[in-house]
């Protein structure tokens, strides 16, 4: 595939990544799939600055990120190491709360209204953010 050197239309460039901010809501798995179909992934927050950048663009709205523990330990969707990486959980979170009455616990992470993170039921229809890295090979065939 060809290397992507600039962001697609309606995506925002920041520090050699491109971001797309939804204005509608989907369950986490549907949001994850949406990003994959765009040759991207749900946003992976690796630094203070990236957190602040995303926070600025989403505003005070619950928004999915690419972090989940559906298979046990917390994992970033792009393989970034969770244990040694940046974290911004609200105090007392994640708590895998079962008291919501929707079955199961809370396995998907989202930005809350103040930007800090919370785990929630993955079926909730929250907004989401897709991210793709510039300079990575795109899946589109090269133009002949």
């Amino acid at each position: 595939g060809s290397e992507r050197t600039c962001c697609p239309v309606n995506w925002v460039e920041h520090e050699r990544s491109c971001y797309w901010f939804s204005r509608s809501g989907k369950a986490w798995a549907d949001a994850d799939n949406y990003c994959r179909l765009e040759d991207a992934h749900l946003v992976v927050v690796t630094s203070w600055e990236e957190q602040k950048f995303v926070q600025h663009h989403i505003g005070p709205v619950n928004t999915w990120m690419g972090l989940h523990d559906q298979n046990g330990p917390w994992k970033w969707v792009d393989g970034t190491d969770y244990e040694t990486g940046f974290k911004n959980w609200r105090p007392e979170q994640p708590d895998d709360w079962y008291g919501h009455g929707l079955g199961g616990g809370e396995d998907c992470a989202h930005f809350t209204d103040d930007g800090r993170w919370n785990d929630d039921v993955c079926q909730r229809p929250y907004r989401w953010v897709c991210e793709t890295e510039l300079d990575k090979a795109s899946q589109e065939p090269p133009l002949l």
Epitope: E49, Q51, K52, N88, P91
Partner: antibody
Framework: QVQLVESGGGVVQPGRSLRLSCAAS????????MHWVRQAPGKGLEWVTV????????YYADSVKGRFTISRDNSKNTLYLQMNSLRAEDTAVYYC??????????????WGQGTLVTVSS | DIQMTQSPSSLSASVGDRVIISCRAS??????LNWYQVKPGKAPKLLIY???TLQTGVPSRFSGSGSGTDFTLTINSLQPEDFATYYC?????????FGQGTRLEIQ
Amino acid sequence: QVQLVESGGGVVQPGRSLRLSCAASGFTFSSYGMHWVRQAPGKGLEWVTVIWYDGSNKYYADSVKGRFTISRDNSKNTLYLQMNSLRAEDTAVYYCARDSLSGIAAAFDYWGQGTLVTVSS
Amino acid sequence: DIQMTQSPSSLSASVGDRVIISCRASQSIFSYLNWYQVKPGKAPKLLIYDTSTLQTGVPSRFSGSGSGTDFTLTINSLQPEDFATYYCQQSYGIPITFGQGTRLEIQ
């Protein structure tokens, strides 16, 4: 009411170490990020370091990286700053300050009165 | 590092005056800009956070505006207790950085 009280300052020779403490009261210490900010005599404010409410993230100014270590004991409601290999340019009043959130906000809504550190031979 | 530049470095004004202090960032910091008031021998005081939100207990004569790289602190109808040094501070990037300060003196 929120109170932050620094201690541990004093006169120390270059190359030596000092540990500052900040005793917090009047709020749930374990829910807030904490910072150290300093002001050298006749100079402006300089941010030094931050620690998240749970210690999960720590950041330092380049001028102190590798020499200073921030830590906290939530069971004692106390913030610490371990200062090693002190230099004359570290001479300042050191303030502990509360982050308005758990760490990322970096707006300092409450400050202590400060403790003076003088590095001199 | 993000450099913060305040202007003027000092200014003289009288009680009742309107004063504007400017702060410029070396790159966009969106709205992550805070203002502090510092008096000799006293702990610094947060006045405004996130560009324009007044901290609880701060008089309404203080206001903030701006976005991106250019920000202002406005003090309407100066009071005697307002004579102090004012600092802007960005919280967008690490290291967190302050402006060099603006000293507001009685004329």
